[in-house]
Amino acid sequence: SYSMEHFRWGKPVGKKRRPVKVYPNGAEDESAEAFPLEF
C-alpha cells in the first residue's frame, strides 16, 4: 500500500518543485539564481 499522505489532487506531500534556473546576465559567465526551498 502507498502510505504517503496525498493532497486531494493526488500529488505527494513534500514533493519539492524544481524551477528552471535563471541566468539574468545571459551570455556572461555567471551562476544561476538560487532555487526556492518550497514544498
Epitope: R17, P19, V20, V22, Y23, A32
Partner: antibody, heavy 114, light 110 residues
C-alpha cells in the same frame, strides 16, 4: 562571449527521426546549466519542449513531448534533441537556450514533409 | 499542466503611448514568470524575470508586475523599436510540466 548554436535541421519524411545538436561556445556544460529546447511553428507561438540539467544529467519534458523527444548531453559543449515519429505538426524552428535567459541559439528549421 | 493565457493577441498604439499585456496562469506560480520580446527572424530576448526584475541592459520603460496567477507587462513611452511579439513564460516547476509559454501578443507601433 557565450553563444549557442543549433544544427541538424532539414527536410525529413513523416514517421522519420531527426537529431538536432546544440553547441556551446565560450563556456562548457560541466558546471551544471539548464539547457532547454523550444520550438516555433511557422507564424506560430513558442512551445517549450524540455530541458536537461547538464550537471546531473536529469531531463525534464513537456507532457506532449514525453516518449517521442529525448534530450541528452553528448559532450562538455553539446546537447542533442532526438525526435522520433515526426509528423507535419512538428515542422518548426527549433531553439536551444540556457535556462531562462537571453542566451538562445538562432534556431534551426525542421520541415516534415513527404 | 500549467496553462498560460496571454491577452490581448494583438495591440496597436502610437509612438509615445502605453501598452499593457496580461498573462494569467491556471495555477499559482509564485513570481516565477519571465517576459520575452521576439522580432521576426530572431530568437526571443529576455526582458523580465521573477515577474518584475529587469534584465541588464533593458530599458526601464518595460515594467513587469504581479504574483500568483495574474501578471502584467507594461511598455510605456512606446518607440518604433518596441514593435515585436511578446511572450510570457512560467518556469515554476520544470519537473511537472510547469514551463509553458503564453500565446504571445503582437505589439504594433503606429
Amino acid at each position: 562571449q557565450q553563444q549557442l548554436e543549433e544544427s541538424g535541421g532539414g527536410l525529413v519524411k513523416p514517421g522519420g527521426t531527426l537529431t538536432l545538436t546544440c553547441k556551446a561556445s565560450g563556456f562548457s556544460f560541466s558546471s551544471g546549466y539548464d539547457i532547454c529546447w523550444a520550438r516555433q511553428g511557422p507564424g506560430k507561438g513558442l512551445e517549450w519542449i524540455g530541458c536537461i540539467d547538464t550537471g546531473s544529467g536529469n531531463t525534464y519534458y513537456a507532457s506532449w513531448a514525453k516518449g517521442r523527444f529525448t534530450i541528452s548531453r553528448t559532450s562538455s559543449t553539446t546537447v542533442t534533441l532526438q525526435m522520433t515519429s515526426l509528423t507535419a505538426a512538428d515542422t518548426a524552428t527549433y531553439f536551444c537556450a540556457k535556462g531562462i535567459s537571453s542566451l538562445w541559439g538562432p534556431g534551426t528549421l525542421v520541415t516534415v514533409s513527404s | 499542466d500549467i496553462v498560460m493565457t496571454q491577452t490581448p493577441a494583438s495591440v496597436s498604439e502610437p509612438v509615445g503611448g502605453t501598452v499593457t499585456i496580461k498573462c494569467q496562469a491556471s495555477q499559482t506560480i509564485s513570481s516565477d514568470l519571465a517576459w520575452y520580446q521576439q522580432k521576426p527572424g530572431q530568437p526571443p530576448k529576455l526582458l523580465i524575470y521573477a515577474a518584475s526584475k529587469l534584465t541588464s541592459g533593458v530599458s526601464s520603460r518595460f515594467k513587469g508586475g504581479g504574483t500568483g496567477t495574474q501578471f502584467t507587462l507594461t511598455i510605456s513611452d512606446l518607440e518604433c523599436a518596441d514593435a515585436a511579439t511578446y511572450y510570457c513564460q512560467t518556469y515554476y516547476d520544470i519537473s511537472d510540466d510547469g514551463c509553458t509559454f503564453g500565446g504571445g501578443t503582437e505589439v504594433v507601433v503606429k
